[in-house]
């Protein structure tokens, strides 16, 4: 239902949300601030060399529920957190990488720089 003189088509938010963006700034961002009708996010994931990389930005309303659910992806260490409670709320999000699985260790707790996907296909 529409209320408060609201005139947009139904969306989760009656107003635009501003988020900090880093490594994930769209063309319409300014000074590392993006805008969205959905969520702000911060994500940590490993790059190809196993180095943790933190990314932040905006997620549009479409499909953001799924993206913010942080479903585990096989062979990929990644964690995402989302927020909407205030502008630039993702400055205060600090997701951590999920713990290494046993199969990610070889010869003790030394993490492979590259995930060898074929290890998981017998």
């Amino acid at each position: 239902k529409k209320e408060d003189g609201e005139s947009t088509a139904p969306t989760a938010r009656p107003k635009v949300l501003r988020c900090k963006c880093h490594h994930h700034c769209p063309e319409d961002s300014v000074n590392n601030i993006c805008s969205t009708d959905g969520y702000c996010f911060t994500m940590i994931e490993e790059d190809d060399s196993g180095t943790p990389v933190v990314t932040s930005g905006c997620l549009g309303l479409e499909g953001s529920d799924f993206q913010c659910r942080d479903t585990p992806i096989p062979h990929q260490r990644r964690s995402i957190e989302c927020c909407t409670e205030r502008n630039e709320c993702n400055k205060d999000l600090h997701p951590t990488l999920p713990p290494l699985k046993d199969r990610d260790f070889v010869d003790g707790p030394i993490h492979h720089k590259h995930h060898h996907h074929h290890h998981h296909h017998h």
């Epitope: 408060d4 003189g5 009656p14 107003k15 319409d28 805008s35």
Partner: antibody, heavy 116, light 112 residues
């Protein structure tokens, strides 16, 4: 119904400051941004900046940084724009306007005259 | 900043005529969310602007269906199918995709 109430006119001296008010009614004040727009006689519209009353987060047009300061008083559902170091170039009509993803309601405008 | 170029600057019409106003932006107004935040406003003499069309083609509540917005990307048009006396004034296009938000210079719709 949505209303944005502004004083009709302000007369101020060069070099001084002025604080223009905009009292909102007919909707939940914190659910929308409040924008401010400048219009000089016979000229177009210029976006000054905006404030989100829910967290007082502001965005400014670079051109008006240092000139305009946006604030809100949520207890009275009132937005304010302070303009400093006034010159004749600041003489204009200033509108407050409700913004979600676009401006849907405007105040009636405050005519600011800077004159000695 | 995104420059909004409106044509014509002045549009003399007879009541009952169709009127057409164009607005071109210096860059695409398609937002990263997929929305296009392009809008039309009418400022009647001595009044504040009022919203006519939001997000390219959506008529705001109470706006007659003789007003029609269209376009995409960088090129947009407002058509008034049968001009009435109450439609006279200055029409502004506007974008809220890119900060700072910007407006066209206005098109004055007047009686021929």
């Amino acid at each position: 119904q949505v209303q944005l109430l502004q004083p009709g006119a302000e007369l101020v001296k060069p070099g001084s400051s002025v604080k223009v008010s905009c009292k909102a009614s007919g909707y939940t004040f914190t659910n929308y941004w409040m924008q401010w727009v400048k219009q000089r006689p016979g000229q177009g519209l210029e976006w000054i900046g905006e404030i989100d009353p829910s967290d007082t987060y502001t965005l400014y047009n670079q051109k008006f940084k240092g000139k305009a300061t946006l604030t809100v008083d949520t207890s009275s559902s009132t937005a304010y724009m302070q303009l400093s170091s006034l010159t004749s170039e600041d003489s204009a009509v200033y509108y407050c306007a409700r913004f979600g993803y676009y401006v849907d309601y405007w105040g009636q405008g405050t005519t600011l005259t800077v004159s000695s | 900043d995104v420059v909004m170029t409106q044509t014509p600057l002045s549009l003399p019409v007879s009541l009952g005529d169709q009127a057409s106003i164009s607005c071109r932006s210096s860059q695409s107004l398609v937002h990263s969310t997929g929305n296009t935040y392009f809008h039309w406003y009418l400022q009647k003499p001595g009044q504040s602007p009022e919203l006519l069309i939001y997000k390219v083609s959506n008529r705001f509540s109470g706006v007659p269906d003789r007003f029609r917005g269209s376009g995409s990307g960088t090129d947009f048009t407002l058509k008034i199918s049968r001009v009435e006396a109450e439609d006279l004034g200055v029409y502004f296009c506007s974008q809220s995709t890119h900060v700072p938000f910007t407006f066209g210079s206005g098109t004055k719709l007047e009686i021929k």
